[in-house]
């Protein structure tokens, strides 16, 4: 899937644009808003009726190297008594993000943008039945 | 930066860390191309902490369209379909990386940008602080 070029007629390619070889693009990986942090309510992964655990995946050939994935603890949801209620289902909520992948081909190195699907947390839903045989 | 394992037979001049600027292939590698959460699942409607999805569009960014979740209620939906204010619907936020055109309007020059998105909502037990 290619990154769309600026197709809007009111956009003109500025003279200041850097020259880039065909089929590639220039990417500055010094992150804008690097220090921005999530300001979520405290411990929501434990307080949720569909609680989850976190796992850190590490890959030195990926930028950023650390990606955190959530896994729902239960199939059902936690009821008011603190028990798992299987009449409801815990389901993962997912979001795509971009990473830069570094590939070694012999002694040369190339870089590739990659979409990664991250499980962010879980929510409790009413189960559905799609098909009764 | 990130330390990268080097092929032992390669010259030592190779930088161990990711360089500040890289040339990358225009093709994005991955099969996860469905970026519209409304099409991928209906969890936003079936959740006990349902949310609405708002389209955020910016042609200077890739992806240009990002969907933002906003919880519909302060409380959660109970078994009777009513809002129960003994529980709270809260957004689940995530930092994601996007591409920002830099300099602006340039077709093939980008910088990584970290943005904070609300992806969905979850139902939690509220924290009650007792004031002495």
């Amino acid at each position: 899937r290619k990154i769309p070029k600026v197709g809007h007629t009111f956009f003109q390619k500025p003279e200041s644009c850097p020259p880039v070889p065909g089929g590639s693009m220039k990417l500055d990986i010094g992150i804008i808003n690097e220090n921005q942090r999530v300001s979520m309510s405290r411990n929501i992964e434990s307080r949720s009726t569909s609680p989850w655990n976190y796992t850190v995946t590490w890959d030195p050939n990926r930028y950023p190297s650390e990606v955190v994935q959530a896994q729902c603890r239960n199939l059902g949801c936690i009821n008011a008594q603190g028990k798992e209620d299987i009449s409801m289902n815990s389901v993962p909520i997912q979001q795509e993000t971009l990473v830069v992948r570094r590939k070694h081909q012999g002694c040369s190195v190339s870089f590739q943008l990659e979409k990664v699907l991250v499980t962010v947390g879980c929510t409790c839903v009413t189960p559905v039945i799609h098909h009764v045989q | 930066g990130i330390t990268i394992p080097r092929n032992p037979g390669c010259p030592n001049s190779e930088d161990k860390n990711f360089p500040r600027t890289v040339m990358v292939n225009l093709n994005i590698h991955n099969r996860n191309t469905n970026t519209n959460p409304k099409r991928s699942s209906d969890y936003y409607n079936r959740s006990t902490s349902p949310w609405n999805l708002h389209r955020n569009e910016d042609p200077e960014r890739y992806p240009s369209v990002i969907w933002e979740a906003k919880c519909r209620h302060l409380g959660c939906i109970n078994a009777d379909g009513n809002v129960d204010y003994h529980m709270n619907s809260v957004p689940i936020q995530q930092e994601i990386l996007v591409l920002r055109r830099e300099p602006p309007h340039c077709p093939n020059s980008f910088r990584l940008e970290k943005i904070l998105v609300s992806v969905g909502c979850t139902c939690v037990t509220p924290i009650v602080h007792h004031v002495a």
Partner: nanobody, 118 residues
């Protein structure tokens, strides 16, 4: 398309036991989760036991906890529901089901009748 086939139902006295089996005809349980639900005449459908394949997480309805056990035989590609200390209120048609993704139960069997007499 996976076809789920249940067996093992029947008539049993209160306090007795039964073991229900569920096989995937024409395929495997290549799903996120598998489970059993039951439906008695005039009553709502009730999930009784569920099993997640990735980590073997099991969970039960309060009404059957301690009496029913869900298990699987990977080699035979079969899911079981061991039911003991059966009560008349356990009388229902029992169905095997699979969810190919969380929260979405796609396939159901034809069901097997369990009748518990007092």
């Amino acid at each position: 398309e996976v076809q789920l086939v249940e067996s093992g139902g029947g008539l049993v006295q209160a306090g007795g036991s039964l073991r229900l089996s569920c096989g995937a005809a024409g395929g495997t349980f290549s799903s996120y989760a598998t489970g059993w639900f039951r439906q008695a005449p005039g009553k709502e459908r009730e999930f009784v036991a569920v099993f997640r394949w990735s980590d073997s997480h099991t969970a039960y309805a309060d009404s059957v906890k301690g009496r029913f056990t869900i298990s699987r035989d990977g080699a035979k590609n079969t899911l079981y529901l061991q039911m003991s200390s059966l009560k008349p209120e356990d009388t229902a048609i029992y169905y095997c089901t699979t969810a190919t993704r969380p929260g979405e139960w796609d396939y159901w069997g034809q069901g097997t009748q369990v009748t518990v007499s007092s």
